[in-house]
């Protein structure tokens, strides 16, 4: 069964800046990745970025840089200032859509005890 992993990290240099990394563990080819915060995209979450392997990347503030790391993993850097910036207990979700298998999603947040720069 395919799985999705999510890793959230606070940048040591900018304490209100976050990096979210997500990956898909499965055999299907990825058609679309959606990153959201505040919960899954279908349950009140707000879309931060949508990554398509052919048609490119769309991102919305406070997302600063979304990119593919591999064919089955992505990373997203969030801007750390402004009213819409994330806080330490924000939940981030990644949804990987693979055709014709379907979609798999997972969520993660920064562990309360983690120091800046450590992986979640």
């Amino acid at each position: 069964t395919p799985e999705v992993w999510v890793q959230v990290r606070m940048e040591a240099t900018e304490l209100s800046s976050f990096t979210i990394r997500c990956g898909f563990l499965g055999s299907g080819s990825i058609s679309l990745v959606t990153v959201s915060w505040g919960g899954p995209n279908g349950a009140g979450g707000t879309t931060l970025a949508v990554l398509h392997p052919e048609r490119g990347i769309r991102q919305w503030a406070p997302a600063r840089q979304a990119r593919w790391e591999t064919q089955s993993s992505i990373s997203l850097i969030l801007e750390g200032s402004g009213a819409s910036s994330p806080c330490a207990n924000t939940t981030f979700c990644c949804k990987f859509a693979s055709f014709p298998e379907g979609s798999w999603e997972a969520c993660g947040s920064l562990p309360p005890s983690s120091d800046p720069g450590l992986s979640a």
């Epitope: 080819s29 055709f99 014709p100 298998e101 379907g102 979609s103």
Partner: antibody, heavy 120, light 107 residues
């Protein structure tokens, strides 16, 4: 303008074969996942077969596995459904449809359909 | 397979009425739900995708809502051209499955 035009339907005896075609135009055919959906007279919609834009990953309805084959010819902008060992219960209107990644794989464009009647 | 149960299976209404069709999934399908309209002898047409997004050219009287397992298609003020059969569909997990359809008829 996106257009999908099916052909190849007709009357065939049980155990016989048919090859359905779907001519696509108005979009980059190679970039989209495609499907065949059927509708028996007075009944609902049923996904029969689907093929990923990479032409590798496919899906088949359990009752047609081993009998039907979905394929496409990028050079001809055409989708095909080879149907062998046809049964009475395969009688239906067959539609080809395009899937849009950005719409959660919803089928955004459909052909007009072609009627397949399996009867002796 | 994920089952999509639509209700009602048929519905009689008048022009100007507000109509609601519901669809219940046998397990969570995230937001991967679409609604289609089909008229006799014609192919289905996409109305709504991702639960609540109207497809190009779809009038604003059509709206979708819901999350998880329960979804709704609402037509705020029925027009003569809206009398048709409506299908919900999930595209969360293969195989994509459809509801059995709701036939909307003129009262």
């Amino acid at each position: 303008e996106v257009q999908l035009v099916e052909s190849g339907g007709g009357l065939v005896q049980p155990g016989g074969s048919l090859r359905l075609s779907c001519a696509a135009s108005g979009f980059t055919f190679s970039s989209y996942h495609m499907s065949w959906v059927r509708q028996a007279p007075g009944k609902g919609l049923e996904l029969v077969a689907a093929i990923n834009s990479n032409d590798i990953n496919t899906y088949y309805l359990d009752t047609v596995k081993g009998r039907f084959t979905i394929s496409r010819d990028i050079a001809k902008n055409s989708l095909y459904l080879q149907m062998n060992s046809l049964r009475a219960e395969d009688t239906a209107v067959y539609y080809c449809a395009r899937h849009e990644d950005y719409y959660g794989f919803a089928m955004d464009y459909w052909g007009q359909g072609t009627l397949v009647t399996v009867s002796s | 397979d994920i089952q999509m149960t639509q209700s009602p299976s048929s519905l009689s209404a008048s022009v100007g009425d507000r109509v609601t069709i519901t669809c219940k999934a046998s397990q969570s399908v995230s937001n991967d739900v679409a609604w289609y309209q089909q008229k006799p002898g014609k192919a289905p047409k996409l109305l709504i995708y991702y639960v609540s997004n109207r497809f190009t050219g779809v009038p604003s009287r059509f709206s979708g809502s819901g999350s998880g397992t329960d979804f709704t298609l609402t037509i705020s003020s029925l027009q003569p051209e809206d009398f048709a059969t409506y299908f919900c569909q999930q595209a969360y997990r293969s195989p994509w499955t459809f509801g059995q359809g709701t036939k909307l008829e003129i009262k």
